[in-house]
C-alpha cells in the first residue's frame, strides 16, 4: 500500500524536514504551508489549522515562497534620469535603470540607486574608454597627429588630414587645414578607433607613412563619479 500523504499541518517524523513549499513552525511544532509569491502569511498555522495567506497589497510584493507577516514595499518611483525596466507587481520589485547618456554610479541589488551623467570629453581630448551601464567615460588627451574638436561622451581622437600643402597645422583640438589641393587621411600615431561610427569625409587615398616609434603621451583619467577632471566637462 502507498504511504499516506500528510496534509499540512502535520508533525514531521523525528530527524526529517518539511517538504518543498512548507516550513517548520516553531510555535506549533508542525510542518505548515508556505505562501506563494504575491502572498504573505495573514495567520500563522497552529496544531490544527494551516497557514492562512493573503494577497500582497498595493505597491508591495513577495518574490519567493514565504511565511512573512507582511509583503515587502516596492522601491520608490524611478527618478527622471532613470527608466523603469520592471514595474512593481505583487511578485517583483520595481527595477530602475539609467537612461541613455547616464551610467549607474551607485548600484543596488537589482537596478540602480543613483545615476550620473556620462563624462563629456572636451576639445583636445577624446574617449579612451566608452561609458557602460556601470562605468563612466574615460577621456585622454589627443596624441600628436590626432584631434577632437567636440565636447562629447562618444567622440574619439581622429587623425589629422594629411595635406600636400598645409595652410594651418592641426593641433589636439583642431584638424589641419590644407590649401586647395586635395587632402588625404593618415593613421597618425596614437589614433584610437573605438567600435563606433566616426564621420568620414570624401578623400583621395594615399599610402600612409610608417607610424612613428615615439612613445605615446596619452594617459587614462580615473573612472567613477569623480569631479570633472582635465579633459572632461560635467555638462
Amino acid at each position: 500500500l502507498p504511504a499516506q500523504v500528510a496534509f499540512t499541518p502535520y508533525a514531521p517524523e523525528p530527524g526529517s524536514t518539511c517538504r518543498l513549499r512548507e516550513y517548520y513552525d516553531q510555535t506549533a511544532q508542525m510542518c505548515c504551508s508556505k505562501c506563494s509569491p504575491g502572498q504573505h502569511a495573514k495567520v500563522f498555522c497552529t496544531k490544527t489549522s494551516d497557514t492562512v495567506c493573503d494577497s500582497c497589497e498595493d505597491s508591495t510584493y513577495t518574490q519567493l515562497w514565504n511565511w512573512v507577516p507582511e509583503c515587502l514595499s516596492c522601491g520608490s518611483r524611478c527618478s527622471s534620469d532613470q527608466v523603469e525596466t520592471q514595474a512593481c507587481t505583487r511578485e517583483q520589485n520595481r527595477i530602475c535603470t539609467c537612461r541613455p547618456g547616464w551610467y549607474c554610479a551607485l548600484s543596488k541589488q537589482e537596478g540602480c540607486r543613483l545615476c550620473a551623467p556620462l563624462r563629456k570629453c572636451r576639445p583636445g581630448f577624446g574617449v579612451a574608454r566608452p561609458g557602460t551601464e556601470t562605468s563612466d567615460v574615460v577621456c585622454k588627451p589627443c596624441a600628436p597627429g590626432t584631434f577632437s574638436n567636440t565636447t562629447s561622451s562618444t567622440d574619439i581622437c581622429r587623425p589629422h588630414q594629411i595635406c600636400n600643402v598645409v595652410a594651418i597645422p592641426g593641433n589636439a583640438s583642431m584638424d589641419a587645414v590644407c590649401t586647395s589641393t586635395s587632402p588625404t587621411r593618415s593613421m597618425a600615431p596614437g589614433a584610437v578607433h573605438l567600435p563606433q561610427p566616426v564621420s568620414t569625409r570624401s578623400q583621395h587615398t594615399q599610402p600612409t607613412p610608417e607610424p612613428s616609434t615615439a612613445p605615446s603621451t596619452s594617459f587614462l583619467l580615473p573612472m567613477g563619479p569623480s569631479p570633472p577632471a582635465e579633459g572632461s566637462t560635467g555638462d
Partner: antibody, heavy 118, light 106 residues
Framework: QVQLKESGAALVKPGASVKMSCKAS????????VSWVRQSHGRSLEWIGE????????NFNEKFRGRATLTVDKSTSTASMELSRLTSEDSAIYYC???????????WGPGTMVTVSS | NIVMTQSPTTTAASPGEKVTITCLAS?????IYWYQQKSGASPKPLIY???SLASGVPDRFSGSGSGTSYSLTINTMEAEDAATYYC?????????FGSGTKLEIK
C-alpha cells in the same frame, strides 16, 4: 486578444451550491491571478477571492472564506468557483476577471447570472 | 474593510462639458483604480495607479488624488461616456469598490 468566457446562467434553491466556470484565452493562463467579483442587482461590485493558476494558491475576502471554493484546470485554462450554502442575498451576476500583475482587474468575463430562489 | 464613497451618486452632463467624479476612502490608500460599466456590459478599466490611462482609453479621461481623496475627470463629455463609474482600492485586503456614479448625457 484576451478573452474570458463564462458558463451559463443558473437558477438554484436556497441552501444549495452553484459551480461556475471561466475559460481564459489570448494570454498565458499561468501568468495572472484570476479573481471572482460579484454584482448584485443595481448594486456595487464585491470581490470574492482569487486564485493563481501558476501556484494553485488562493486569497479570499473573509466574508466568503469557507463558502467559496476556487480551482483551476491548467490543461484547459479554466478557472472555476463553487459557492455553497446559498441564500437569496447571493443572487447576482458573477464575473471572473484577470487580475493585472498589479492590483486591478484588466479583463472581465461577460458574467454568469445566478438566481437563488425556492 | 476600507469603504470607498463616491460622489455624486448620479449626474448628467452635456456634450463638451467637463465632468469630475470623486472617491473618498475611509482610510489612506496608495492608489486608486477606475472602471467604466455601460448598461448590460462588464466593467472596463479606465485608470490604473491613480493617474495612468488603461490601454485604449481616450485621453479626455484623467485621474488624480492622494491619501483619502481621489477624482476622475472627463475633460469634454461625449455621448459614449454615459455609463456608471466605479473606483477601487487594493491598499488593504480585501479590495473594495465604490458604490458607483451614474453619468448620463443631457
Amino acid at each position: 486578444q484576451v478573452q474570458l468566457k463564462e458558463s451559463g446562467a443558473a437558477l438554484v434553491k436556497p441552501g444549495a451550491s452553484v459551480k461556475m466556470s471561466c475559460k481564459a484565452s489570448g494570454y498565458t493562463f499561468t501568468d495572472h491571478w484570476v479573481s471572482w467579483v460579484r454584482q448584485s442587482h443595481g448594486r456595487s461590485l464585491e470581490w470574492i477571492g482569487e486564485i493563481s493558476p501558476n501556484y494553485d494558491t488562493t486569497n479570499f475576502n473573509e466574508k466568503f472564506r469557507g463558502r467559496a471554493t476556487l480551482t483551476v484546470d491548467k490543461s484547459t485554462s479554466t478557472a472555476s468557483m463553487e459557492l455553497s450554502r446559498l441564500t437569496s442575498e447571493d443572487s447576482a451576476i458573477y464575473y471572473c476577471s484577470r487580475t493585472n500583475s498589479g492590483w486591478y482587474f484588466d479583463f472581465w468575463g461577460p458574467g454568469t447570472m445566478v438566481t437563488v430562489s425556492s | 474593510n476600507i469603504v470607498m464613497t463616491q460622489s455624486p451618486t448620479t449626474t448628467a452632463a452635456s456634450p463638451g462639458e467637463k465632468v469630475t467624479i470623486t472617491c473618498l476612502a475611509s482610510s489612506s490608500v496608495r492608489n486608486i483604480y477606475w472602471y467604466q460599466q455601460k448598461s448590460g456590459a462588464s466593467p472596463k478599466p479606465l485608470i490604473y495607479s491613480t493617474s495612468s490611462l488603461a490601454s485604449g482609453v481616450p485621453d479626455r479621461f484623467s485621474g488624480s488624488g492622494s491619501g483619502t481623496s481621489y477624482s476622475l475627470t472627463i475633460n469634454t463629455m461625449e455621448a459614449e461616456d454615459a455609463a456608471t463609474y466605479y473606483c477601487q482600492q487594493w491598499s488593504r485586503n480585501p479590495p473594495t469598490f465604490g458604490s458607483g456614479t451614474k453619468l448620463e448625457i443631457k
